[in-house]
Amino acid sequence: TLNSVLNSNAIKNLPPPLGGAAGHPGSAVSAAPGILYPGGNKYQTIDNYQPYPCAEDEECGTDEYCASPTRGGDAGVQICLACRKRRKRCMRHAMCCPGNYCKNGICVSSDQNHFRGEIEETITESFGNDHSTLDGYSRRTTLSSKMYHTKGQEGSVCLRSSDCASGLCCARHFWSKICKPVLKEGQVCTKHRRKGSHGLEIFQRCYCGEGLSCRIQKDHHQASNSSRLHTCQRH
């Protein structure tokens, strides 16, 4: 078996959720239901169990964030909650749905100068007055040797997109997160669906570049839902 498939190093890997298998059924093109992941020392299957306990946003799907389920609720119990749509209230970027970010407490549409919600994590921010640790899982803000003085080039390990050079975003790539190219016109993109086909987001693509959006490829309209190919297309 692969050793330490997902360890708890923040810049490289997602930490395992409390008492469960590593990874989380996020909504990604890399959905692979029922695959086996090491949870502790033995393999177990990952099902779409709800609610999903979490310690930080990066353990949740790309259209979810980690928080206490009730306002002023027990700070020691956090679960993955559905992201907030545009114009909804927020306290940090991760609360907003892909393509939006949190500005002045409201989710607003991203532009080229801001975070892209489908990739970014805000590991260093805590949720309101909640504690920044949960049963031993800290938010790990110390990155020691992995803090860079220069912007990361394609393929280098990163924590967030601001670590990467222009034209790159920080996206998960199996064992870690690395700087990947922002997608160009015609390239395959990942359209995140709100429900169903949840898989482990161990592989992410960047978002489409400026003036492009991720849409079903014209000649794939007749294909079955599962095999529809999305590509970056002009607005």
């Epitope: 360890n7 393929g155 390990v157 064992w175 190219p181 390239q187």
Partner: antibody, heavy 116, light 110 residues
């Protein structure tokens, strides 16, 4: 210029130990993963495992788990592949490669011959 | 036996177009994971040819292109040249977090 320079060819006997190296230059050693790939004579490529030199986090292919050890020394920007007890079937060319989005830079290879 | 299946050999005359297929399954290529292509010239280390989402490293001519559909991927080489004679390997990832290679395809330029 990114370069991965591997140690020279080795001829060993079964049961002997061996450690081959891959010296990296031209980029920050601790910002990319380094992988090892085996190519047996006349055969294809087999992924052995990968290491993140920043903290020595290592992943192995199930086929090579327990058979080899991958390590790295940050102070000299060098990755290693080692065997504690070689077998004749370990005879192969071994490549180190930088893992970016793909294996974007490769070493020249180290030929390991194990024969009694 | 490789997880990704490639034809052992393909051939073509100079100037022609050849394609090399790479067939996987729902736990690798079909899961949406990237497919990369490498060229290995005789007695040399492999070289990255195409990576990820149809990206070519600098120096790789646009005669080389790739495509992906379902659980398969393919590499196309147009305007075949004598120096293209080499072994070609596809590479992807498996849901078990393993790197997987195809068995390789020997391209002969007639």
């Amino acid at each position: 210029e990114v370069q991965l320079v591997q140690s020279g060819a080795e001829v060993k006997k079964p049961g002997e130990s061996l450690k081959i190296s891959c010296k990296v230059s031209g980029y920050s050693f601790t910002t990319y993963w380094i992988g090892w790939v085996r190519q047996m004579p006349g055969k294809g490529l087999d992924w052995m495992g990968i290491i993140y030199p920043g903290d020595s986090d290592t992943r192995y292919s199930p086929s090579f788990q327990g058979q080899v050890t991958i390590s790295a020394d940050k102070s000299i920007s060098t990755a290693y592949l080692q065997w504690s007890s070689l077998k004749a079937s370990d005879t192969a060319m071994y490549y180190c490669a930088r893992q970016g989005i793909a294996f974007d830079y490769w070493g020249q290879g180290t030929l390991v011959t194990v024969s009694s | 036996q490789s997880v990704l299946t490639q034809p052992p050999s393909v051939s073509g005359a100079p100037g022609q177009r050849v394609t090399i297929s790479c067939t996987g399954s729902s736990s690798n290529i079909g899961a949406g994971y990237d497919v990369h292509w490498y060229q290995q010239l005789p007695r040399t280390a492999p070289k990255l040819l195409i990576y990820g989402n149809s990206n070519r490293p600098s120096g790789v001519p646009d005669r080389f292109s790739d495509s992906k559909s379902g659980t398969s991927a393919s590499l196309a080489i147009t305007g075949l040249q004598a120096e293209d004679e080499a072994d070609y390997y596809c590479q992807s990832y498996d849901s078990s977090l393993s790197v997987i290679f195809g068995g390789g395809t020997k391209l002969t330029v007639l």
